[in-house]
Interface confidence: low
C-alpha cells in the first residue's frame, strides 16, 4: 500500500523537515529558515512560534519542530502551550487588575502565582490551630483540645497537609 | 549590521535629572528586550532591569526602584534610561543591551555619567 | 536574590596557560523550563561585555573553541584551554533564571 501510495503521490515521500515543492517539479525541499514541518508529505512548512517581548525561547524552531517559549522571568506561563504570561507576585500576594496585592486576613498564597486561598479550618477535622497561619503559608492544625488532656503523651505536630507550591522561577 | 549606539558623556549636579539613550540599528526593535546594566568606577556589572519593548513595560530590580524610569520611542528604535535627584552614588557608566534568547547578545558602548557638585 | 559569587577574585596567569573560573550561586539556576540561564562574559578595559557562554555551556558565535563552560544547579566553571593576550580581562558570570537578574563579582585574569 505504502509504495502504491507513494508511485502516486510523490509528496508522501518528503520527510519531516522538507515540503513538496510544487514549483520545482514536486521534489522534496528543505524548509525555508524560521519555518518546519513535523510531519512529512506536507506540501508547505509552517512559520516558526517568535518568542517576542515578555516570552523567551525555552527551545528553538528547527526544521521539524516548532519554537516553544516561556516567560522571562518575574513572569509565568499561562494558557496551553504558554499562550500568554503572567506577572509573578510576592508569596502572600495575589495579582489583581491593579497589580500585587497582599492577601488579606484568613487568606494565604505559597506561591508565586495564583489567588490567597483561605486558611484551613482545623476545627471542621476536630482540631485545635497549632501554629497560626500568615499571608505566606497555612495554619498547621494539631490534636484537638481533648486529645491533650492530662496524661497524654506529648504529640509530634503532622507535616501541612499540603506541600508548599515550588514557583516557577 | 547590529548596534545599539548610547548618548554621551553626562556631568551633573546632585538633584539634577539625565536621561540616557541607547539607539538601536539593524534588527527589528520590538522583537527583543532592551536592559540596562550599571558599572560604578572600578566596580562589577549590576543589572537594573529591562524594557519590555512590545509592549512598552518596565521592570526594575529592587535596588532601582523609584528614581529610575526606563521609557521607549518605538518609531525611533530608542530606549531611554531617565535618573531623577541624581546622587553621588549614581555616578557610573550605563549600558544598555539587547535580550535574544535570554542572554545579551549586543551591548551598547556604555554612557559616562559623573554626578559631582 | 540569587547571589553568584565567584572565585578566584584574580587568576594570574602566563600565556599559554590553562585557566578556571569557579560561579556559585546560591539557589539552583535551573529553571522550571528545564533550562540554565547561566552565562559567562568578558569585559576588557574601556570596552562593553561581551558574550562568551550561554546556556551553561553553549559558545556564543565567533568565540574560540578554547572556551568552554560546564557546571549544573549551584556550581559552574569557566576554563580557557590555552589563555592568549587578547583573554585578559575581567569574567563575570551571570544568572537570567530567577528575578532579579544578577551577576557575579568578577575575576580578573591578568599577567604574572
Known amino acids: 500500500f505504502e509504495r502504491t501510495r507513494s508511485l502516486q503521490d510523490p509528496c508522501s515521500n518528503c520527510p519531516a523537515g522538507t515540503f513538496c515543492d510544487n514549483n520545482r517539479n514536486q521534489i522534496c525541499s528543505p524548509c525555508p529558515p524560521n519555518s518546519f514541518s513535523s510531519a512529512g508529505g506536507q506540501r508547505t512548512c509552517d512559520i516558526c512560534r517568535q518568542c517576542k517581548g515578555v516570552f523567551r525561547t525555552r527551545k528553538e524552531c528547527s526544521s521539524t519542530s516548532n519554537a516553544e517559549c516561556d516567560c522571562t522571568p518575574g513572569f509565568h506561563c499561562l494558557g496551553a502551550g504558554c499562550s500568554m504570561c503572567e506577572q509573578d507576585c510576592k508569596q502572600g500576594q495575589e495579582l489583581t487588575k491593579k497589580g500585587c496585592k497582599d492577601c488579606c486576613f484568613g487568606t494565604f498564597n505559597d506561591q508565586k502565582r495564583g489567588i490567597c486561598r483561605p486558611w484551613t479550618n482545623c476545627s471542621l477535622d476536630g482540631k485545635s490551630v497549632l501554629v497560626n497561619g500568615t499571608k505566606e503559608r497555612d495554619v498547621v492544625c494539631g490534636p484537638s483540645p481533648a486529645d491533650l488532656s492530662p496524661g497524654a503523651s506529648s504529640v509530634t505536630p503532622p507535616a501541612p497537609a499540603r506541600e508548599p507550591g515550588h514557583s516557577p522561577q | 549590521q547590529i548596534q545599539l549606539v548610547q548618548s554621551g558623556p553626562e556631568l551633573k549636579k546632585p538633584g539634577e535629572t539625565v536621561k540616557i539613550s541607547c539607539k538601536a540599528s539593524?534588527?527589528?526593535?520590538?522583537?527583543?528586550?532592551i536592559h540596562w546594566v550599571k558599572q560604578a568606577p572600578g566596580k562589577g556589572l549590576k543589572w537594573m532591569g529591562w524594557m519590555n519593548t512590545e509592549t512598552g513595560e518596565p521592570a526594575y530590580a529592587d535596588d532601582f526602584k523609584g528614581r529610575f524610569a526606563f521609557s521607549l520611542e518605538t518609531a525611533a528604535s530608542t530606549a531611554y534610561l531617565q535618573i531623577n535627584h541624581l546622587r553621588d552614588e549614581d555616578t557610573a557608566t550605563y549600558f544598555c543591551t539587547r535580550s535574544s534568547y535570554g542572554y545579551f547578545d549586543y551591548w551598547g558602548q556604555g554612557t559616562t555619567l559623573t554626578v559631582s557638585s | 536574590d540569587v547571589v553568584m559569587t565567584q572565585t578566584p577574585l584574580s587568576l594570574p596567569v602566563s600565556l599559554g596557560d590553562q585557566a578556571a573560573i569557579s560561579c556559585r550561586s546560591s539557589q539552583t539556576l535551573e529553571h522550571i523550563n528545564g533550562n540554565t540561564y547561566l552565562e559567562w562574559y568578558l569585559q576588557k578595559p574601556g570596552q562593553s561585555p561581551k558574550l562568551l557562554i550561554y546556556?551553561?555551556?553553549d559558545r556564543f558565535s565567533g568565540v574560540p573553541d578554547r572556551f568552554s563552560g560546564s557546571g549544573s544547579g549551584t556550581g559552574f566553571t569557566l576554563k580557557i584551554s590555552r589563555v592568549e593576550a587578547e583573554d585578559l580581562g575581567v569574567y563575570y558570570c551571570f544568572q537570567g533564571s530567577h528575578f532579579p537578574l544578577t551577576f557575579g563579582g568578577g575575576t580578573k585574569l591578568e599577567l604574572k
Open positions: 546556556k551553561v555551556s
Open positions: 539593524g534588527y527589528s526593535f520590538t522583537d527583543y528586550s
